[in-house]
């Protein structure tokens, strides 16, 4: 067909340390030579469909699927993945070919599947099909568990697509708040994939293998709890399953629960209800809202209502890629030697992050705590009052985040001295950075009060040891002071320290600390 455009489909593999990837989803920089994917016309298909060669990608690899269109005039386009439309921004290269790119950062199971690209040019419309799968490598993986409803039963199945096969356990707790901590006596663990008892206060599923342990909590709105000031928020990525449980207890069975999304009742097949009598004969009802594979239009306010309880809502936000939101500006702190102090980073992230704190090339475990407002916080208190640069690093499947902190400890200077044949130097790491004086000790000035100003060279922040500033002062030797004792003094707002040096002919120098 003469009218059909010339189409080239390519795969660009990005190196993992490629800093250019993800800076712009429209124009990723090529880090390896593009691999031609063919893009042949698919026979016997209704409409014009091009099919690219199947793409196999390593777990966590970053790739770009790119289409080059040699067709006159403007083009418009739309990507579709798992029934969701994704942004598409065509641009033109130097040869005036239309270029459409889809960047996949850190490939995961949920990003595998068919990517359809619909292109409309002035002459014709056509579709390009990419099939992306994860290469079957022996790489170990540990994926966050997700829930599915058991066929024809009121039960949940917990699934974690991990290698090696993980041990799956349900972690149940029937009390509130702090007492639901992992090792609390209120916590019950069940090492099985299917859970029938779905009325508990707190329900989590965990999967563990050689790589560690990942857990997912069953998101719950409890209508018997006083409505929170902050609306709970749930993030999910396109293609992931959505599960929200609404729970209510009342003195009798005379009440019902309903779910609405943006004030429209959920369609049948997107919810199921269970009820039971508790030990004190009150009625417990739970109503699950679920979507097996979410799309962008599942975003919104999900409201659970009851005739006998105040309504409550949760904001569900569906994102195309995971994220870490936090301020990455570096922060400087100045504390006293015995002052209690913790670094802290407040962030919002999905999926949950893995993080580390680093100081002096040593990594420390990182704990995160969820706050009521949808944010999480990580604190680091184990600095042992060592001044320097501390680094917080966080990452999830799709995003990375680094924040730098500098810790300065207010203290009186400590002075160290060294000398050579031509000069004497003094060093101090006190904070605030000290100022220096040099004094000459002689018969005229036995208390060393005669100030030396000539030949003195001060260097602030001479070297940086893991963020710890060191100040130095050097005295160039002259005939006028050779053979004399000199005293260098470092002083700041917290005090003064001095060191006395005998400036004799070359050889070892005696130092006398004089605080």
């Amino acid at each position: 067909n003469q009218d059909l455009p010339v189409i080239k489909c390519v795969l660009i593999n990005h190196k993992n340390n490629d800093s250019s990837v993800g800076k712009s989803s429209s124009y990723p920089m090529v880090s390896e030579s593009p691999e031609d994917l063919g893009c042949a016309l698919r026979p016997q298909s209704s409409g014009t469909v091009y099919e690219a060669a199947a793409v196999e990608v390593d777990v966590s690899a970053s790739i770009t699927l790119q289409v080059l269109v040699d067709a006159p005039g403007n083009i418009s386009c739309l990507w579709v993945f798992k029934h969701s439309s994704l942004n598409c921004q065509p641009h033109f290269d130097l040869q005036n070919r239309g270029v459409v790119s889809m960047v996949i950062l850190k490939m995961t199971e949920t990003q595998a599947g068919e990517y359809l690209l619909f292109i409309q040019s002035e002459a014709t419309n056509y579709t390009i099909l990419f099939t992306v799968s994860i290469r079957n490598t022996l790489l170990y993986t540990l994926r966050r568990p997700y829930f599915r409803k058991m066929e024809n039963q009121d039960a949940l199945v917990c699934i974690s697509e991990s290698v090696p096969e993980p041990i799956v356990e349900w972690v149940l707790c029937d009390s509130q708040g702090e007492s639901c901590k992992e090792e609390s006596p209120a916590v019950v663990k069940k090492e099985e994939k299917v859970l029938h008892e779905l009325f508990g206060t707190d329900i989590r599923c965990c999967a563990r293998n050689e790589l560690g342990r990942e857990c997912t909590r069953l998101f719950t709105i409890d209508l018997n709890q006083t409505p929170q000031t902050t609306l709970p928020q749930l993030f999910l990525k396109v293609g992931e399953p959505l599960w929200i449980r609404c729970k209510a207890v009342h003195v009798n069975h005379g009440f019902g629960l309903t779910w609405e999304l943006e004030n429209k009742a959920l369609e049948e097949g997107n919810y199921f209800e269970m009820s039971t009598y508790s030990t004190n004969r009150t009625m417990i009802r739970i109503l699950f809202a679920f979507v097996s594979s979410v799309a962008r239009n599942d975003t919104g306010y999900y409201t659970c209502s009851s005739s006998k309880h105040p309504s409550q809502s949760a904001l569900v936000t569906i994102v195309e890629k995971g994220f870490i939101n936090a301020t990455n500006s570096s922060e400087d702190y100045e504390i006293d030697q015995y002052e209690e102090f913790c670094f802290s980073v407040r962030f919002k992230a999905y999926p949950q992050i893995r993080c580390t704190w680093t100081f002096s090339r040593k990594s420390f475990p990182c704990e995160q705590k969820g706050l009521d407002n949808g944010y999480s916080i990580s604190k680091f208190c184990n600095h042992k009052h060592q001044p320097g640069e501390y680094i917080f690093h966080a990452e999830n499947d799709d995003a990375q985040f680094t924040k730098m902190f500098t810790l300065n400890i207010r203290r009186k200077p400590q002075v160290l001295a060294e000398a050579s044949a031509s000069q004497a130097s003094c060093f101090s790491d006190g904070y605030p950075l000290p100022s220096w004086t040099w004094k000459k000790c002689s018969d005229k000035s036995p208390n060393c009060t005669e100030e030396i100003t000539e030949g003195v060279w001060n260097r602030k922040a001479n070297r940086k040891v893991f963020g710890q500033w060191v100040s130095s002062s050097t005295l160039n030797m002259s005939e006028a002071i050779k053979g004399f004792l000199v005293k260098c003094c470092a002083y700041n707002s917290l005090g003064t320290s001095c060191e006395t040096i005998l400036l004799n002919s070359p050889g070892p120098f005696p130092f006398i600390q004089d605080n």
Epitope: L231, N263, Y301, T303, S305, S307, P310, S311, S313, L315
Partner: nanobody
């Protein structure tokens, strides 16, 4: 853009009454439930009352029997009638629809 505007606050003697209003714009008012919250100086914001789409009302234990919530869908307004006020009712009162909050109106009850 959803906007909520409270009014009707003021200074009142213990045992007296006030009627607060919450006027909403930019929201299909008749299909949302609306909450009143309050925040006393130095305390956390606390839930006070709710009225649902079909005019079911719910109250915090501390105000049951003294406060009454109502709505006028034609005027896109919710009211909080506060009777037998006590000094501990002193607070800034806010109305809320989903994630949206008003600016608040100050209620001061003197003894």
């Amino acid at each position: 853009q959803v906007q909520l505007q409270e009014s009707g606050g003021g200074l009142v003697q213990a045992g007296g009454s006030l009627r607060l209003s919450c006027a909403a714009s930019g929201v299909t008012f008749s299909i949302n439930y609306i909450d009143w919250y309050r925040q006393a100086p130095g305390k956390q914001r606390e839930w006070v009352a709710q009225i649902t789409r079909d005019s079911n009302s719910f109250y915090a234990d501390s105000v049951k029997g003294r406060f009454a919530i109502s709505r006028d869908n034609a005027k896109n307004t919710v009211y909080l009638q506060m009777n037998n006020l006590k000094p501990e009712d002193t607070a800034v009162y806010y109305c809320r629809v989903l994630s949206y909050w008003g600016q608040g109106t100050q209620v001061t009850v003197s003894s």
